[in-house]
């Protein structure tokens, strides 16, 4: 990929430039919501240009979107995945180092012409971990045009089992979305004991279907005050 | 292309049971809902319940809670709905529907004695 | 239960005519959360608006759906031949997904 990498002569100081024009010539882009989408502006300078990008004219910031985006600085690209109707916009690239800045931009069109299920955003829950008696919060960051319902769930055990006599396993909702439930994409739990260790689901579902995503809680052992004899603790799950 | 295609007409007897069934092609099958909704003769849609095939997660209608039972078996991309003593009052064309957007051609049920 | 209380429950019309068909949920729901379908006789129900204005894909320009709270509305801008059906809207905020009763638009 001849145009990733474009080494200049260090006394040959240049302004940017674009290294394939070729790739950027598709200036609209008109994307099935939940697709991919990845604009790139190949392009050389000396000394090498920085790249960043604009959406409608103004910082694009991670915050600005669901799930983020991903900047490939190596192949001059900006990509965001499941992309959704807000994403629609124009993205312009600025490319530049201390002797001029050039600039692109695209059109990004979401094509939205079916319902579909709900669209979690990636690595949420994220795993968590705290002392017995400490406080922690899970996020569930949902993207559905119909508004889901969002539970909450955890596996728990009865009779020191897991699963039940149908192999299914025995899950318990902590929260679920509704009137008298405020942020259900939020899961607060206080003064957790070692019992609440374990995986918490976040599942979603509106009448297309649904999605899950799951993290895991770590439940550490409270620390002894300095100058106290180490208690033990026998612990029999 | 993504389409359902529901069992043949059935006439029945009150008392007998039936099963009636919807299969899912063209798309995956396991990532959207089948919901079954009811159309009795001269009258309007009612949503009886609906399925989603990758946990079998079922919820039924209040009015239809007892009186039938939705399945679905995700190995074969196919969902059924049964009845365990037909009444007459159960002749009704029945369609499934995955999500909103896809319909099946429906399945003509009469119970007549 | 959520009741969809659909208005007229049937309309004459001719062709050309700007037809307008409501809906009223007897609840606050989601403006998103209300979808819109045409029945001919002997055929299954075909989605037209989903979440109360985006038209689903190949549906005619003319049909378009708008509201939010308890109010909806489905519009036909210039009735066309193929149109003459009976009408549907639905709710999917909460079980059971409820439809109203319909609207049959018959040729004057």
């Known amino acids: 990929m001849a145009e990733d990498f474009v080494s200049e002569n260090s006394n040959n100081k240049r302004a940017p430039y674009w290294t394939n024009t070729e790739k950027m010539e598709k200036r609209l882009h008109a994307v099935p919501a939940a697709n991919t989408v990845k604009f790139r502006c190949p392009a050389g300078g000396n000394p090498m240009p920085t790249m960043r990008w604009l959406k409608n004219g103004k910082e694009f910031k991670q915050e600005h979107r669901i799930g983020g985006y991903k900047v490939r600085n190596q192949h001059w690209s900006l990509i965001m995945e499941s992309v959704v109707p807000s994403d629609k916009g124009n993205y312009t690239c600025v490319v530049e180092n201390e002797y001029g800045s050039i600039n692109h931009t695209y059109h990004l069109d979401v094509v939205e012409r079916s319902p579909h299920r709900p669209i979690l955003q990636a690595g949420l829950p994220a795993n968590a971990s705290t002392v017995v008696g400490g406080d922690v919060e899970f996020v569930c960051k949902v993207y559905s045009d119909a508004q889901p319902h969002i539970q909450w769930i955890k596996h728990v055990e009865k009779n020191g089992s897991k699963y039940g006599p149908d192999g299914l396993p025995y899950l318990k909702v902590l929260k679920h979305s509704g009137i008298n439930s405020s942020n259900a994409e939020v899961l607060a739990l206080f003064n957790v004991t070692e019992a609440d260790a374990g995986e918490y689901i976040c599942k979603v579902s509106n009448y297309i279907g649904q999605a899950n995503q799951s993290a895991w809680l770590t439940v550490l052992p409270k620390q002894q005050a300095p100058g106290r004899e180490k208690e033990h603790h026998h612990h029999h799950h | 292309q993504v389409q359902l295609v529901q069992s043949g007409a059935e006439v029945k007897k009150p008392g007998e049971s039936l099963k009636i069934s919807c299969k899912g092609s063209?798309?995956?099958?396991?990532?959207?809902?089948i919901h079954w909704v009811r159309q009795m003769p001269g009258k309007g849609l009612e949503w009886m319940g609906a399925i989603y095939p990758d946990n079998s997660d079922t919820t039924y209608s209040p009015s239809f809670q007892g009186q039938v039972t939705i399945s679905a078996d995700k190995s074969i991309s196919t969902a059924y709905l049964q009845w365990s003593s037909l009444k007459a009052s159960d002749t009704a064309m029945y369609y499934c529907a995955r999500g909103a957007d896809i319909w099946g051609q429906g399945t003509l049920v009469t119970v007549s004695s | 239960d959520i009741q969809m209380t659909q208005s007229p429950s049937s309309l004459s019309a001719s062709v050309g005519d700007r037809v307008t068909i409501t809906c009223r949920a007897s609840q606050d729901i989601d403006p998103y959360l209300s979808n819109w379908y045409q029945q001919k006789p002997g055929k299954a129900p075909k989605l037209l608006i989903y979440?109360?204005?985006n038209l689903q894909s190949g549906v005619p320009s003319r049909f378009s759906g708008s509201g939010s709270g308890t109010d909806f509305t489905l519009t036909i801008s210039s009735l066309q031949p193929e149109d003459f059906a009976t009408y549907y809207c639905q709710q999917t905020t909460s079980h059971p997904y409820t439809f109203g009763q319909g609207t049959k638009v018959e040729i004057k």
């Open positions: 979440d109360a204005s």
């Open positions: 063209g798309y995956s099958f396991t990532n959207y809902y």
